[in-house]
């Protein structure tokens, strides 16, 4: 959508993020262990034929699967793809995975599992030592911190050497925090749910994660339609319908990771207003700048004008003001049966000499009122380096 | 494990106060909707009023002015502070925790057992 | 205030029968409606939430069905377990009232 400003292409965030190129230190590269010195973390660089030609772990993988490779960004980062090889070894290498789990953290302490879009965690790897298998991450992972799990199917030897592709996640949003998705009784049920979040989940709410209101992709007119393949009606959007909310609107609250100057808040919606979805009747936030500080300031206010009987999808922009914050909490109003959101971003500014928040920690419960919230796309840094971006080719490994 | 358990019911007088408590094991109080409902001798059960995670309460319209819904998260425990209490108050008062189904809306998949509040002079 | 209004309020059945109890909501609801089912000195049980959403462990001889204002539960071929009574319940975030219930009795 020509109208989401800011909005990152995730088709376009696949660059390399630093194993081959070197520009990731070896001190940011380690491991649960390694065989040896010559095949220790450092020598886990795609493409490269230093030491023994790869990471080795010590441990067996099979049966348990505890040994890592884990590689620190040092900054939250959007990672779409990544490569693995076996070990070089001059061409004598003869070890390699033949599948790998991954696992990712923003913060260093609470760690996630990636899964694919139908809850598949185990992504296949190597069939020989040299070859580069690449695998599109879909949903992108946002992470400071990712750790390779290579599989085994027996006890063998695995080595491994691996690159990153993303982009810097410029946008800080650590987490978003909303109502369950809830579905759809049409002629066919439509699954509002946001599907990939990768928080928590109590009682109604979801907290602490990121998931499909972040990932990039924008939904379509018709929101039982889906960019994806193979994928359930719905599964663009997250939803909610106005009956469940006695108060009138969704209520969301966006953790970012420093002090931000806050100019727009852009939501894609729905507004298939023939099947109940409606753009919200208007958007009030209001900001903070810790998580047990009072709310600062008048909320702001923004009503929704515009053309509403249009039933295409669109970006609606909320002026933001310049609010200074790290905390947000916004409250969507109905203007009909359903709010349907693809993707919430935000349009900030870092405020100079503000520190990162602890590695972006998670409240320990939450501290706003209820209803459904909104999430955010990112702006990104797209080209690092002036590197090219790898290609995603229909029907290609990468898929 | 996972429970609620009521406490607080007995005999009161008419015009007297009552307050109730819900004490949970299990989970966090502060990470769900929890309601109290009411179910009087021989009758249906009767929704009293309910707290958000964030501490926003709602009422019955007969309930509004006399009961009041609070929580204590350092005990876990959720309250119902009943003032002025009529005979008609007579009942078994639960507590219960709303959770969500796969499809996303809500449903009280854990109560507790119940206290008896009998109002008589 | 929203109401909900459930009939019959009785219903005498056998086991094997196929058993239908409506629930009425004053106004359109979506599909936020939940069936519990209590039995004497207990507390209720959830059913379905969602209309039609199943709640962990309930036999699937027990169904939902509607939208907007009127809402039934099924119960296909009733067990000598299943006399009880049932109630629906409106329930948004937020207030959350319960229809007048039925109760299945044995024929």
């Known amino acids: 959508d020509a109208d989401m400003k800011g909005h990152f292409d995730p088709a376009k965030c696949r660059y390399a993020l630093g194993m081959q190129d070197r520009t990731i230190p070896d001190s940011d590269i380690s491991a649960s262990s390694s065989w040896s010195d010559s095949t220790a973390a450092r020598h886990s660089r795609l493409e490269s034929s230093d030491g023994d030609g790869a990471w080795c772990p010590a441990g067996s993988v099979f049966p348990k699967e505890e040994e890592y490779l884990q590689v620190d960004l040092q900054r939250l980062h959007l990672v779409a793809l990544v490569g693995t090889q076996g070990r070089h070894a001059g061409g004598l290498g003869k070890e390699f995975s033949r599948s790998y789990r991954l696992r990712y953290s923003r913060d260093g302490r609470r760690w996630m599992g990636w899964k694919d879009r139908w809850g598949q965690e185990v992504i296949s790897g190597n069939e020989d030592p040299e070859g580069v298998v690449l695998k599109d991450l879909g949903p992108p992972m946002v992470a400071r911190l990712v750790r390779f799990y290579p599989r085994a199917d027996r006890v063998m030897s695995v080595c491994l050497r691996v690159e990153l592709y993303g982009c810097l996640w410029r946008d800080g949003l650590l987490s978003y925090t909303a109502p369950v998705g809830q579905t759809m009784y049409l002629s066919e049920a439509v699954y509002l749910n946001d599907s990939t979040y990768d928080g928590h989940t109590v009682g109604g709410l979801q907290y602490g994660g990121l998931g499909q209101l972040a990932d990039g992709v924008v939904g379509l007119d018709d929101f039982r339609k889906s960019q994806e393949l193979r994928v359930w009606p719905g599964y663009d959007y997250v939803g909610w319908s106005n009956h469940s909310f006695s108060s009138g609107y969704v209520e969301m609250e966006f953790e970012f990771d420093r002090l931000r100057a806050f100019q727009a808040m852009q939501v894609h919606c729905n507004n298939m207003h023939t099947l109940g979805a409606r753009l919200p009747g208007g958007v009030e936030c209001r900001f903070r700048r810790g998580p047990a500080m009072a709310w600062e300031g008048e909320p702001m206010r923004h009503n929704l004008g515009g053309n509403l009987g249009d039933p295409r999808a669109r970006a609606v922009s909320v002026p933001l003001g310049g609010r200074v914050a790290r905390f947000l909490q916004c409250r969507f109003l109905f203007a009909g049966p359903w709010l349907l959101f693809s993707e919430i971003s935000f349009i900030s500014d870092v405020v100079n000499n503000s520190s990162p928040a602890l590695g972006g920690t998670f409240p320990p419960a939450p501290w706003w009122p209820p209803g459904p919230p909104p999430t955010n796309f990112s702006s990104l840094e797209l080209e690092p380096r002036g590197q090219q971006p790898v290609a995603k080719a229909e029907g290609s490994p990468t898929a | 494990q996972v429970q609620l358990v009521e406490s607080g019911g007995r005999v009161v007088q008419p015009g007297r106060s009552l307050r109730l408590s819900c004490t949970a094991s299990g989970f966090s109080l502060n990470r769900y909707y929890m309601l109290w409902v009411r179910q009087a001798p021989g009758k249906g059960l009767e929704w009293i009023g309910t707290?958000?995670?964030?501490?926003?309460?709602y009422y019955a319209s007969w309930a509004k002015g006399r009961f009041t819904i609070s929580r204590d998260n350092s005990k876990n425990t959720l309250y119902l502070q009943m003032n002025s209490l009529r005979a008609e108050d007579t009942a078994v008062y639960y507590c219960a925790r709303a959770d969500t189904g796969d499809n996303g809306y809500l449903g009280l998949q854990l109560w507790g057992q119940g206290t008896l509040v009998t109002v008589s002079s | 205030d929203i109401q909900m209004t459930q009939s019959p309020s009785s219903v005498s059945a056998s086991v094997g029968d196929r058993v239908t109890i409506t629930c009425q909501a004053s106004q359109s609801i979506g599909s936020v409606l939940a069936w519990y089912q209590q039995k004497p000195g207990k507390a209720p049980k959830l059913l379905i939430s969602?209309?039609?959403d199943l709640a962990s462990g309930v036999p699937s001889r027990f169904s939902g069905s509607g939208s907007g204002t009127d809402f039934t539960l099924t119960i296909s071929s009733l067990q000598p377990e299943d006399f009880a009574t049932y109630y629906c319940?409106?329930?948004?975030?937020?207030?959350?009232?319960f229809g007048g219930g039925t109760k299945v009795e044995i024929k």
């Open positions: 707290i958000s995670y964030g501490d926003t309460t």
């Open positions: 319940q409106y329930i948004p975030y937020g207030s959350s009232p």
């Open positions: 969602g209309v039609f």
